[in-house]
């Protein structure tokens, strides 16, 4: 009886794993083996595919074959018993084009209200992605184990920290890789779960802001308790994109080590031009907080995008606010070349209820105010340029009293 050729050959490539699967054409014939040959582009001869000779199952692995992953290859398969079937040729393919990104490796660290996720490619020193290793981005799905409500986070790098979580709570997540340059989306990792720790005695510092005063940067933050010491560290932002090493060498800002106030001042020349991450930690001598959320700090923008200066003309039921360019000794605000948008926050002095106005104009009316009432106003500038999505810090608050009831004109 003539043996039939195997059919429906599928080539699965995940990272550097090359797997072939096929269907037996005749289930009734026993003790059949299968063999593959391959042919490279521009070659006439066929070569035996090592790892896929005299296979008794309908699956084989040819990962050991050192192929140029960017070069097209062709495969053929036949069945063998006493005689052999005719060859069945598989459509030619380029391994790199066909390859899928495998599940990444994931390691988790827990804090009380945060989880640190370390992600690395599932195949170390992969041949398939050798030229693309630096281009991997990742996305993840995270959920509370108890609720199952999923949150998706896109475009993250090899280390990512998720904040604002609940203490003593189990969170689960899965991660997949993407190579956007090649339009490739990977396979999800297995689900990893971790429980956040008991709430720390000391919370991390919050609301970190950087401003410029003369030739110095002023770093301010909020903290719950008094009599604390703080330290501030910085890291080049680009290092977060470096997948190679899991050690981030955060550096101390010398003038911000063991400071006893919720601010520190350091010279602008501490930082060369660039984008940095800053973080702050609190200590009371016995206990240490976890690190604050990291803030991005761009020296180019920080030096120029200063909080707006404004004047207030008070009426009985409104304020007229006139916004001018910030005055800075020896520091021309270059950023004025960019269109700015102004965020104005105002509140009744005796209340915490803030209201917000966003305006492109430099003269703004704050309506619906009560007569003879003290209101406070602060403002900040935002760039409208998409590539340069930056904000200044808020100006200091200015408080004014509205006029008596008959002066609305």
């Amino acid at each position: 009886k003539n043996l039939k050729s195997p059919q429906k050959v599928e080539v699965d490539i995940i990272d550097d794993n090359f797997i072939l699967r096929w269907n037996r054409s005749d289930e009734s014939v026993g003790n059949v083996t299968f063999s593959f040959d391959y042919q490279k582009t521009g070659m006439d001869n066929w070569i035996k595919l090592s790892g896929c000779q005299n296979i008794t199952s309908t699956k084989c692995n040819f990962s050991s074959l050192k192929l140029n992953v960017y070069e097209e290859i062709k495969l053929r398969i036949r069945a063998e018993k006493e005689n052999t079937s005719s060859w069945y040729e598989v459509d030619s393919f380029t391994p790199f084009r066909k390859a899928q990104i495998g599940p990444p490796e994931v390691h988790l660290e827990a804090e009380d209200k945060a989880i640190v996720i370390h992600i690395s490619p599932g195949t170390k020193d992969s041949v398939m992605w050798a030229l693309d290793g630096l281009s991997f981005t990742y996305s993840l799905v995270i959920w509370k184990n108890s609720s199952g409500v999923e949150e998706r986070i896109e475009n993250i790098y090899s280390r990512h920290k998720i904040y604002k979580l609940s203490p003593e709570t189990t969170y689960c997540l899965k991660v997949k890789a993407a190579l956007l340059t090649s339009w490739k989306i990977g396979v999800y990792s297995p689900v990893h779960c971790i429980k956040t720790t008991v709430e720390n005695e000391l919370p991390p510092p919050e609301n970190i802001e950087v401003s410029v005063q003369n030739q110095n940067y002023v770093l301010k933050w909020d903290y719950t308790y008094a009599n604390m010491t703080f330290q501030v560290q910085w890291l080049h932002a680009f290092l977060k994109r470096n997948p190679g090493n899991h050690l981030y060498k955060w550096k101390q800002i010398p003038d911000c080590e063991n400071v006893k106030t919720t601010q520190c001042v350091f010279p602008q020349n501490v930082f060369q031009k660039g984008i940095y991450l800053l973080r702050v930690q609190a200590s009371d001598g016995n206990n240490t907080s976890f690190w604050s959320e990291e803030i991005k700090f761009d020296t180019e923008i920080q030096a120029f995008l200063l909080p707006p200066v404004f004047n207030i003309r008070s009426l009985s039921d409104s304020f007229h606010i006139y916004i001018g360019a910030p005055k800075q000794s020896g520091n021309t605000p270059v950023i004025q070349d960019y269109p700015l948008i102004y965020e104005i926050i105002f509140w009744e002095n005796t209340s915490n209820a803030e209201r917000k106005i966003i305006e492109k104009k430099t003269d703004v009316t704050v309506p619906n105010l009560k007569p003879l009432t003290v209101y406070c106003v602060k403002a900040r500038a935002h760039t409208m340029d998409e590539k340069l999505n930056k904000s200044s810090v808020f100006s200091d608050a200015v408080c004014e009293k509205t006029k008596p009831g008959n002066t609305s004109k």
Partner: antibody, heavy 118, light 107 residues
Amino acid sequence: QVQLVQSGAEVKKPGASVKLSCKASGFNIKDYYIHWVKQAPGQGLEWIGRIDPEDAETKYAPKFQGRVTMTADTSISTAYMELSRLRSDDTVVYYCGRYHGYWALDYWGQGTLVTVSS
Amino acid sequence: DIQMTQSPSSLSTSVGDRVTITCKTSQNVGTNVAWYQQKPGKAPKPLIYSTSYRYSGVPSRFSGSGSGTDFTLTISSLQPEDFATYYCHQYFSYPYTFGPGTKVDIK
């Protein structure tokens, strides 16, 4: 493969100084921190400090501050620890270790025994 | 400084036994705890990092768990080569510290 090879045993007199070396191979020393740990005979492990070989930034345990100096020569992939004003209770084994972020101290040297005796 | 305590300080046990060593820290260190095994005259050998991850080449009978201030090293079925001293180590904040050690010897 990754290796940390430490210098040989030393015998010193009280009040003297000793400089130990830790030669790294199989990795770029600039990408990691090198830590030093001491262990007295029959006792536990005690952290002395660490150096970032890339820029020579150091952190020392308060107990050793002022008496220990860590340096590195990246051109020969070697970290050093100098301990001054030696006392008899400095008769211990000193280990260097590679620190790799959340991987902690993932490789250790074989240790150097320093004996302080008059 | 963060203080670390380990219990028990020593234990006598037999091959095949399940062994649990606990480590307490004086403050919350997240999951920044590692475990090392040391035999006489040898350098410490890394077993577990980040509380629960085994270093490559470490047998699966070794496992770590815990977070915050309470950590555990478990050896599911003790083998002859496991008789040694075990140290926990916090690398959350400077100065880094080690536990005093737990000596596991033959009953």
